[in-house]
Amino acid sequence: EEELQVIQPEKSVSVAAGESATLNCTATSLIPVGPIQWFRGVGPGRELIYHQKEGHFPRVTPVSDPTKRNNMDFSIRISNITPADAGTYYCVKFRKGSPDVELKSGAGTELSVRAKPSAPVVSGPAVRATAEHTVSFTCESHGFSPRDITLKWFKNGNELSDFQTNVDPAGKSVSYSIRSTARVVLTRRDVHSQVICEVAHVTLQGDPLRGTANLSEAIRVPPFLEFTQQSMRADNQVNVTCQVMKFYPQRLQLTWLENGNVSRTEMASALPENKDGTYNWTSWLLVNVSAHRDDVKLTCQVEHDGQPAVNKSFSVKVSAHPKEQGSNTAAENTGTNERGSSDYKDDDDKHHHHHH
């Protein structure tokens, strides 16, 4: 009779996580009698995976009935494979004894586990930034194997090139993680923009995973301020409007000051959205000219999204005339946009106002 050989025909086997792995092993002889054992790894620290003679191995099933006569097929099937099962498996023949004596090992079969990456999670900056600034977005995905993976960034469908990607760990592992940081230059038109992180991996059958982040979470578009004044009404009142335009997000507080005194404070709410995702807001102030002897300096003070206040001032000229006469009043837009903060004092009952 020929000398026993233990044959493991496959050098490597690749299996998707969750599936079963079949590890093939045949012996060339029934002699000597004795059990087959399967191990992962070699040396004293090797892990027993299956013992034909004894033990309970709930995930392992012999492919051939071990009680079958003339059985020389010692292949096993391992169910519900996870990345932790990766490694090299050895089919080892033992000679019957007390204890059994190791006789011959197969050459080993390397089991690699194809595990899908987790859905990419994209996170943006902790604080908002304004147009022309560069912000960083991070994309993370975990638990994939093998290590080879492709990650791309897109902004509104256009591929980005300014990003850095790391796959960890650098050495051999049962599974890997990827982390990529992309730098994106903001524009005022980016409220509706989206960044997409796209991950392609062998386990995804050409259908990449995507994670998205809305630039609306990262951008701040500061407002433009504009004054307009309507001509004097018969009741000596002038309607002055402060237009707050093209801002995002909606969080905005507007304060009217008359000669430096707070006249009214308003909070923006439930504003209609512009096509580009920004908001406009108009506030009116009725100035009772007859209540003033001198020119009135009006200031529209806007605090947007917790940023320092932006001021726009405007002078309403009060002509010298008897109060009862309906005389013309000149108004002048000073055109100043000032940044600075004010003390807010609600003085709403000083004048009659009409506002939206």
């Epitope: 029934l30 009698v33 004795g34 013992h51 004894e54 009935d65 071990p66 009680t67 006569r69």
Partner: antibody, heavy 119, light 110 residues
């Protein structure tokens, strides 16, 4: 350490039945055949039958096919051999034996159960 | 059915001498490249013990003075140098089909 522990001696009347048990330990019970062999006093070995505990497949010696029944209880790793319609010439030591190599051989043996059939 | 016939029925050999027991099958027991013959030793009051499997392979723990040989229909168990503890009845068994035993050979010391 493979061990096969058999039930105690039995005395039966002709025509009765006997059920001998064999409790296995030290190995995976369902992975190996169990054989039953008997030996009448001063006589040779006579193979009765064998059973695969994994699926209860059985093979019987034609001589015993109608009178012997082999069963197993995998939850307790115990094999049973029942012999019916006992006659005086069924008086023998009944052995269970495990087939370690699936070669239809008998590698490990119980110590035997003496069944005496006498009126 | 295959019938096994052992010879002699009994045998007396001096300590240290060679003992030879034969087993003849009524038809060949060779199949799949193996000779399906096994040899057992049974001492008084004990169950049998497997000595040789597949005609020529010593079971674990069996002293190397025991050897098996033969092919097809004729097989031999040899004890090269008889020891006192070898006194027993020896049986051959085949499993070419369902198992049967030879009638046994009683070995004694001369």
């Amino acid at each position: 350490q493979v061990q096969l522990v058999q039930s105690g001696a039995e005395v039966k009347k002709p025509g009765a039945s006997v059920k001998v048990s064999c409790k296995a330990s030290g190995y995976t019970f369902t992975n190996y055949w169990i054989n039953w062999v008997r030996q009448a006093p001063g006589q040779g070995l006579e193979w009765i039958a064998m059973i695969d505990p994994s699926d209860s497949e059985t093979h019987y010696n034609q001589i015993f096919k109608d009178r012997a029944t082999l069963t197993t209880d995998t939850s307790t790793s115990t094999a049973y051999m029942e012999l019916r319609s006992l006659r005086s010439d069924d008086t023998a030591v009944y052995y269970c034996a495990m087939d370690y190599g699936s070669l239809y051989a008998m590698d490990y043996w119980g110590r035997g159960t003496l069944v005496t059939v006498s009126s | 059915d295959i019938v096994l016939t052992q010879s002699p029925d009994s045998l007396a050999v001096s300590l240290g001498e060679r003992a030879t027991i034969n087993c003849r099958a009524s038809q060949s027991v060779r199949s799949s490249g193996y000779n399906w013959i096994f040899w057992y030793q049974q001492k008084p009051g004990q169950p049998p013990k497997l000595l040789i499997y597949l005609a020529s392979n010593r079971d674990s723990g069996v002293p190397d003075r025991f050897s098996g040989s033969g092919s097809g229909t004729d097989f031999t168990l040899t004890i090269s140098s008889l020891q006192a503890e070898d006194v027993a009845v020896y049986y051959c068994q085949h499993s070419r089909e369902l198992p049967t035993f030879g009638q046994g050979t009683k070995l004694e010391i001369k």
